[in-house]
């Protein structure tokens, strides 16, 4: 039976949420972010084999055409399906402020 | 000046909308779709160099970390930012129906 969450390539190799620890310098944020000084970035990494976490009909089409024309049409890609908010203490023109970003940390992943 | 729509790799090589002509057989739809018999599939194809059509802050982070850890973090990926609807005449248990799909044809593209 088809299982959109079972990776045929082996455990952990397909599209899933990963956490990458990064400093403000790594992110290019050192000149405007004050805290947190280390960020645990959640992002979507991994392969998108056929029928694995397909986001929609477009992803199905893309996979079918990729199999037919692999040099022209790329395979679906592992991207965030939704995001978690993140708060940063950042520099502003007038001082410092807390700012929440809604599009910064991946919450879960799918293939598009 | 930074321009998120100017491709540094040369014209047409960065993330953009492409049209791929496909038959129902190509798409694996021949057993359930009656019309159209050829579909002009619009999809997002192309490279995502730094700052090109970045969808959000997550895409910026991903690019920065990709440059630092290219073996661990992939570059951002060219995916649909929105979709155009498409109507299909399809077989049903009781006969034939017109069905509109909202997630089938890419309308425009960005890098995530």
């Amino acid at each position: 039976a088809r299982n959109g969450d079972r990776c045929p390539l082996g455990p952990g190799r397909c599209c899933r949420l990963h956490t990458v620890h990064a400093s403000l310098e790594d992110l290019g944020w050192a000149d405007w972010v004050l805290s947190p000084r280390e960020v645990q970035v959640t992002m979507c990494i991994g392969a998108c084999p056929s029928q694995f976490r397909e986001a929609n009909m477009h992803a199905q089409i893309k996979m079918n055409l990729h199999r037919l024309k692999p040099d022209t049409v790329p395979a679906p890609c592992c991207v965030p399906a939704s995001y978690n908010p993140m708060v940063l203490i950042q520099k502003t023109d007038t001082g410092v402020s807390l700012q929440t970003y809604d599009d910064l940390l991946a919450k879960d992943c799918h293939c598009v | 000046a930074r321009n998120g729509d100017r491709c540094p790799l040369g014209p047409g090589r960065c993330c953009r909308l492409h049209t791929v002509h496909a038959s129902l057989e190509d798409l694996g739809w021949a057993d359930w779709v009656l019309s159209p018999r050829e579909v002009q599939v619009t999809m997002c194809i192309g490279a995502c160099p730094s700052q090109f059509r970045e969808a959000n802050m997550h895409a910026q982070i991903k690019m920065n970390l990709h440059r630092l850890k290219p073996d661990t973090v992939p570059a951002p990926c060219c995916v649909p930012a929105s979709y155009n609807p498409m109507v299909l005449i399809q077989k049903t248990d009781t006969g034939v129906s017109l069905q509109t799909y909202d997630d089938l044809l890419a309308k425009d593209c960005h890098c995530v």
Partner: antibody, heavy 119, light 112 residues
Framework: QVQLQESGPGLVKPSQTLSLTCTVS??????????WTWIRQHPGKGLEWIGA???????VYNPSLKSRVTISVDTSKNQFSLKLSSVTAADTAVYYC???????????WGQGTLVTVSS | DIVMTQSPLSLPVTPGEPASISCRSS???????????LDWYLQKPGQSPQLLIY???NRASGVPDRFSGSGSGTDFTLKISRVEAEDVGVYYC?????????FGGGTKVEIK
């Protein structure tokens, strides 16, 4: 507005494990940047940072308590918890849960719960 | 661990008059980004602590402008320009430069 509420037994016997839970309401514990923190205050004394947890589960502890402390998170229940093992009378304190950005800016606190260690 | 020392231990004040609390750290709290990683908290009788000042001199949301933080490196001051009756309680400084964050012993402000 986010609210934090501590819960757990007010009396623990010496050598046993103190267990407290902090329930977060009015906001998600899954917010990045925030560290969900435990701080205690001995009777009539100052404040001591115990440790903190990020929603992903990574933790940081005060070295002075590290061997006895475990902080965990249950994102499905929007809760995080403190366990302090092998308690003595010196662990008698008001225990607060709080939300900070990394190790600073604790702008939301629970009301605190007094835990007495006594036989 | 960084040791935080506050003075005075107790501060009797007259409503409408200014008040000043000193905090000294055993090592510099000045980060390479130019900001001092120091918070000030007020614990009113029978209540949880509340954030007044973060990053040395930035008032937290909702804190009256009669409160101000200053100083750099190892020497910091919290000033109340005109004390009000509701300002009574114990004031704590806290270093946030490195883990574990550590608090000063507190300064008890009471009305004369």
């Amino acid at each position: 507005q986010v609210q934090l509420q501590e819960s757990g037994p007010g009396l623990v016997k010496p050598s046993q494990t103190l267990s407290l839970t902090c329930t977060v309401s009015g906001g998600s514990i899954n917010s990045g940047g925030y560290y969900w923190t435990w701080i205690r205050q001995h009777p009539g004394k100052g404040l001591e940072w115990i440790g903190a947890i990020y929603y992903s589960g990574s933790t940081v502890y005060n070295p002075s308590l590290k061997s006895r402390v475990t902080i965990s998170v249950d994102t499905s229940k929007n809760q995080f918890s403190l366990k302090l093992s092998s308690v003595t009378a010196a662990d008698t304190a008001v225990y607060y849960c709080a939300r900070g950005v990394e190790y600073q800016h604790f702008n939301e606190w629970g009301q605190g719960t007094l835990v007495t260690v006594s036989s | 661990d960084i040791v935080m020392t506050q003075s005075p231990l107790s501060l009797p004040v007259t409503p409408g008059e200014p008040a000043s609390i000193s905090c000294r750290s055993s090592q510099s709290l000045l980060h390479s980004n130019g900001y001092n990683y120091l918070d000030w908290y007020l614990q009113k009788p029978g209540q949880s602590p509340q954030l007044l000042i973060y990053l040395g001199s930035n008032r937290a949301s909702g804190v009256p402008d009669r409160f101000s933080g200053s100083g750099s490196g190892t020497d910091f001051t919290l000033k109340i320009s005109r004390v009000e009756a509701e300002d009574v309680g114990v004031y704590y400084c806290m270093q946030t430069l490195e883990a574990p964050p550590t608090f000063g012993g507190g300064t008890k402000v009471e009305i004369k």
